[in-house]
Every structure is written in structure tokens, then in C-alpha cells.
């Protein structure tokens, strides 16, 4: 079922079907015998009770006040009253733009990132049974889509998709043809979600080791989901059976990015492992960043100037 009209301030365009649905509808069914009344007041005017006799354009059904269609002089405050329950709305009916297929003040703006999923579905659940056909327009030019009941666009967004999309539902009521227009202003922006990946810690790291022992070199980065982190060493990775790349660990950050950690394990350290570069690289669509590790024999550490360790 269509949800109730909870917004207290509503703007609608003249000439379109419109309805107000109060929010104690389920309650109203329970107490069928209770008196339920709709009122309107505009300006200095007192509350005037509404009924189908007050205007041929107004219809009352259970929880709903319908306008066929709504007109400029329908602007005002509307009240629904039942026992000790009251709901109030302020309705502002604005002029239709005669020179366009939509009225600028009645546009919903949406921002879609390029290459991200972009969808427009023309649906109107309340009037669904009365709708004969629906058309979708882009910048007031009709789009030729297969489904003329619920036209839909589903695609990966591109910059050319930017524009005003208007869903126009055509429906009959009491022998008259009406239309309801819902317009979206779609702005396509660049992918804003990507960060430039950051390798954590110093760019050059000297690690003190002892021959015959093992060492674990930890490379950590803050990165995007599709970014890669890997180790490069020697002429061809994997030529040294004592060197192992451990499984990457990833933890999602509260911002939806990833904290990744990849360990290079070097077992039974030999002379050939000393004073060579073990590079950890993070790569993204924005470029690469590299961090280097050099294994140095513990005894030789004294020869290395202190500033090297914080570079």
C-alpha cells in the first residue's frame, strides 16, 4: 500500500492529479464508525469541511483526499480529523511551466558518479491501476524504450547521461485524460570515492638481521578496493625458495576504504639476502607508490647513519 503523506509542507504543480493520505489509516479501519472529516482553510477563511459536493474535482476514499486535478486555488492548509487525532498539511500549488515538459521547482536532483550504476524507473504505485501508459523524456525529448508501462534506464553512468529525465504517466479518470510528471535532474560527476593509496611508514627501511635467522617484512597501506599491493625482489620473484609472500590481510575502514597488510617472510637469511632491495608497491589507477626494505647484518648497523632509519 502507498505510504501516508507525512510531509507537512507540500508543493505540487497545477493540473495534475494529487492526493493526501493521512497517517492513521490502519487505525481508521479499526473504528469504522468514528466520524472522519477533512477540512481546508486558506488565508483568513475558517475551516471549511470538504466533501465531494464542495467540488467536482475532489474525491474522498477511506484515508485519502484526491484532487482531479489540483488547481492553483487549492493552495492552503488541509486538516484530517478523527476523534482526538488531527493531521495537518500546508499545500502550495504552483504554476505549470507552459514552455517545458516539466516545472523547474518540482525537480528532484540526483548526483551519480561516472561509471557507477545509474537507474531511473518510472513508477507511480498510487495511480498504478489507472495508468494507461508512461513515457520517459530526456531534456523533453521522448526516449524510445521497450516498456511503455514502466520505462526504465539501467546502465553504467557516462557524462553524456547528464540531463533532466521526466517520467510522464498518462491516466484516465471519469472519462478525462490526466498526466503526472516526475522529473529528475541527473548530474554526472567524476568518481569521488577513490583515495590516492598511501604506503604507511618510511619509504626506506634498514632492517637489522642475523644470518640463518628469519625475518618478516610488513608492508601496510591504506587503499581502495581495486588497488593492489605486492612485493618485488630479485630478478624474478619466486626464484629464492626461502622467500615467501604471505596472504594479504585486509580490513575495511569506517570510511569504506581498506587497510591492507602484506608480509614478506625471508627464512634462513643468507649473504645473498643482504644489501638488496625488497620493494613493496601499491598500484592504483592514480599511479604507483613504492617502499623499500634493505636487510643489514646486525653487526653492520653501527655503520649506518641514524637519519637513514627515519627517512
Amino acid at each position: 500500500a502507498e505510504s501516508c503523506t507525512s510531509r507537512p509542507h507540500i508543493t505540487v504543480v497545477e493540473g495534475e492529479p494529487f492526493y493526501l493520505k493521512h497517517c492513521s489509516c490502519s487505525l481508521a479501519h479499526e473504528i469504522e464508525t468514528t466520524t472522519k472529516s477533512w477540512y481546508k482553510s486558506s488565508g483568513s477563511q475558517e475551516h471549511v469541511e470538504l466533501n465531494p459536493r464542495s467540488s467536482s474535482r475532489i474525491a474522498l476514499h477511506d484515508c485519502v483526499l484526491e484532487f482531479w486535478p489540483v488547481e492553483l486555488n487549492d493552495t492552503g492548509s488541509y486538516f484530517f480529523q478523527m476523534k482526538n487525532y488531527t493531521q495537518k498539511w500546508k499545500l502550495n500549488v504552483i504554476r505549470r511551466n507552459k514552455h517545458s515538459c516539466f516545472t523547474e521547482r518540482q525537480v528532484t536532483s540526483k548526483i551519480v558518479e561516472v561509471k557507477k550504476f545509474f537507474q531511473i524507473t518510472c513508477e507511480n504505485s498510487y495511480y498504478q491501476t489507472l495508468v494507461n501508459s508512461t513515457s520517459l523524456y530526456k531534456n523533453c525529448k521522448k526516449l524510445l524504450l521497450e516498456n511503455n508501462k514502466n520505462p526504465t534506464i539501467k546502465k553504467n553512468a557516462e557524462f553524456e547521461d547528464q540531463g533532466y529525465y521526466s517520467c510522464v504517466h498518462f491516466l484516465h479518470h471519469n472519462g478525462k485524460l490526466f498526466n503526472i510528471t516526475k522529473t529528475f535532474n541527473i548530474t554526472i560527476v567524476e568518481d569521488r570515492s577513490n583515495i590516492v593509496p598511501v604506503l604507511l611508514g618510511p619509504k626506506l627501511n634498514h632492517v637489522a638481521v642475523e644470518l640463518g635467522k628469519n625475518v618478516r617484512l610488513n608492508c601496510s597501506a591504506l587503499l581502495n578496493e581495486e588497488d593492489v599491493i605486492y612485493w618485488m625482489f630479485g630478478e624474478e620473484n619466486g626464484s629464492d625458495p626461502n622467500i615467501h609472500e604471505e596472504k594479504e590481510m585486509r580490513i575495511m575502514t569506517p570510511e569504506g576504504k581498506w587497510h591492507a597488510s602484506k608480509v614478506l617472510r625471508i627464512e634462513n637469511i643468507g649473504e645473498s639476502n643482504l644489501n638488496v632491495l625488497y620493494n613493496c608497491t601499491v598500484a592504483s589507477t592514480g599511479g604507483t607508490d613504492t617502499k623499500s626494505f634493505i636487510l643489514v647484518r646486525k653487526a653492520d648497523m653501527a655503520d649506518i647513519p641514524g637519519h637513514v632509519f627515519t627517512r
Epitope: 590516492v196 605486492y230 592514480g286
Partner: antibody
């Protein structure tokens, strides 16, 4: 719209250098790396290297190491590729391309190396 | 370096028929951390720069007709054109962007039979 505009064709003598420019527009320049890809006449595509427009980090193909330099100027959203010590087999169309899968390409710059 | 090998080198297919191009990488381009394949397909027509068709092995680039599709994982990939059109005559390249140097296949020339 998003595009990469490259500098014009060049004719160079062996041993000389060439510098090709690639001006980006329609997107945030520093969000994407710029790769350079070349194509010798009638041949396939060869990746030369790339530069991060964000921090200037570079990564070059091994065979061009020492002869190629890639730079960027973020104030003008322009990437540059300089190739030195030109040889006849460097004759090719040089393309700049965006990102790591190349969704936007320049039109290409023909560099002819001939004595 | 990761070596990309395409097959066949050239291919002749009748209009409206299916065209299939294969690409094999010397090592896996599937990244286990996010289950993505770092592989793209390009189309190049004479005198033009290449045009991106497919990335992440199977995601079609915006504006590319849906007769183009990519499949495969790890080391074996396929580009399929479901119903060949005259404008599809071109050279097609696969490319890995898993590790630098980013490498291309040698290309497959597609012609009409």
C-alpha cells in the same frame, strides 16, 4: 568532455631527443596516472611506462630505462614524455592514455627518426 | 614480466556470426584480495588510437555495444562478439594491468569472411 590532447608530429635525427606533451581536460588530473604507449608502423602496442599525476612517481619499462623521462605539470594538467638518444626503431606513434586500464587515449603523436 | 599471448593472430568471420578471441597470461592476473581480474580488451581501427571495450575482464565500458562481452579468470580470457557487424573489423588487444610493466597481447586482426 574528458580528453587528452597531444602535441604534433616530430621528425628527429638519430641521437636526438623528443619531448611529447599530453594535455588533459574534463577530469581531475591528479586522480589518474598517465601511461605512455607506443606503436611502431604495422606493429602492436608497447607500454613505455607511467607517471602518477598526484605525486610524480614513475614506473618505466625496463628496455627504456635511462632513455625515457616522464613528468607532469599539474598547473596546466599536462603530462610530458621525453625520449633521448633516439634510434630508427623508435619511429612510432606515441600515445598517452589515462589510468591503468586505458579508458581515454590521446590521438597519438607520430615521431619519425631518420637521418 | 607477464607475457600476454593472443590467439588466433587473425580471424575471418561472416557478418552476423560469433567471433571469439582468446588471451592467455603467463601468470594469473586474478587478485585474491578482491577477486578481480586485472585484464582489459581494446579495439583499434586503422589510423585511430585504441578504444577500451572491456575492463576487469568482463565489465563493458560505457557506450560499448552489448554484443561485446568478456569472460575468463586467472590466466585464460575470451573476448566474444556475439553477432559480427561490418564496423567491428579491427585489431583487438588484451592487456594486463596487474603488475608493471603493463603488457599487451600481440593483437588479433578480425576481418569479414
Amino acid at each position: 568532455q574528458v580528453q587528452l590532447v597531444q602535441s604534433g608530429a616530430e621528425v628527429k635525427k638519430p641521437g636526438a631527443s623528443v619531448k611529447v606533451s599530453c594535455k588533459a581536460s574534463g577530469y581531475t588530473f591528479t586522480n589518474f596516472g598517465i601511461s605512455w604507449v607506443r606503436q611502431a608502423p604495422g606493429q602492436g602496442l608497447e607500454w613505455m611506462g607511467w607517471i602518477s599525476a598526484y605525486n610524480g612517481n614513475t614506473n618505466y619499462a625496463q628496455k627504456l630505462q635511462g632513455r625515457v623521462t616522464m613528468t607532469t605539470d599539474t598547473s596546466t594538467s599536462t603530462a610530458y614524455m621525453e625520449l633521448r638518444s633516439l634510434r630508427s626503431d623508435d619511429t612510432a606513434v606515441y600515445y598517452c592514455a589515462r589510468g591503468w586500464f586505458f579508458d581515454i587515449w590521446g590521438r597519438g603523436t607520430l615521431v619519425t627518426v631518420s637521418s | 614480466d607477464i607475457v600476454m599471448t593472443q590467439s588466433p593472430d587473425s580471424l575471418a568471420v561472416s557478418l552476423g556470426e560469433r567471433a571469439t578471441i582468446n588471451c592467455k597470461s603467463s601468470q594469473s592476473v586474478l587478485y585474491s584480495s578482491n577477486n578481480k581480474n586485472y585484464l582489459a580488451w581494446y579495439q583499434q581501427k586503422p589510423g585511430q588510437p585504441p578504444k577500451l571495450l572491456i575492463y576487469w575482464a568482463s565489465t563493458r565500458e560505457s557506450g560499448v555495444p552489448d554484443r561485446f562481452s568478456g569472460s575468463g579468470s586467472g590466466t585464460d580470457f575470451t573476448l566474444t562478439i556475439s553477432s559480427l557487424q561490418a564496423e567491428d573489423v579491427a585489431v583487438y588487444y588484451c592487456q594486463q594491468y596487474y603488475r608493471t610493466p603493463y603488457t599487451f597481447g600481440q593483437g588479433t586482426k578480425l576481418e569479414i569472411k
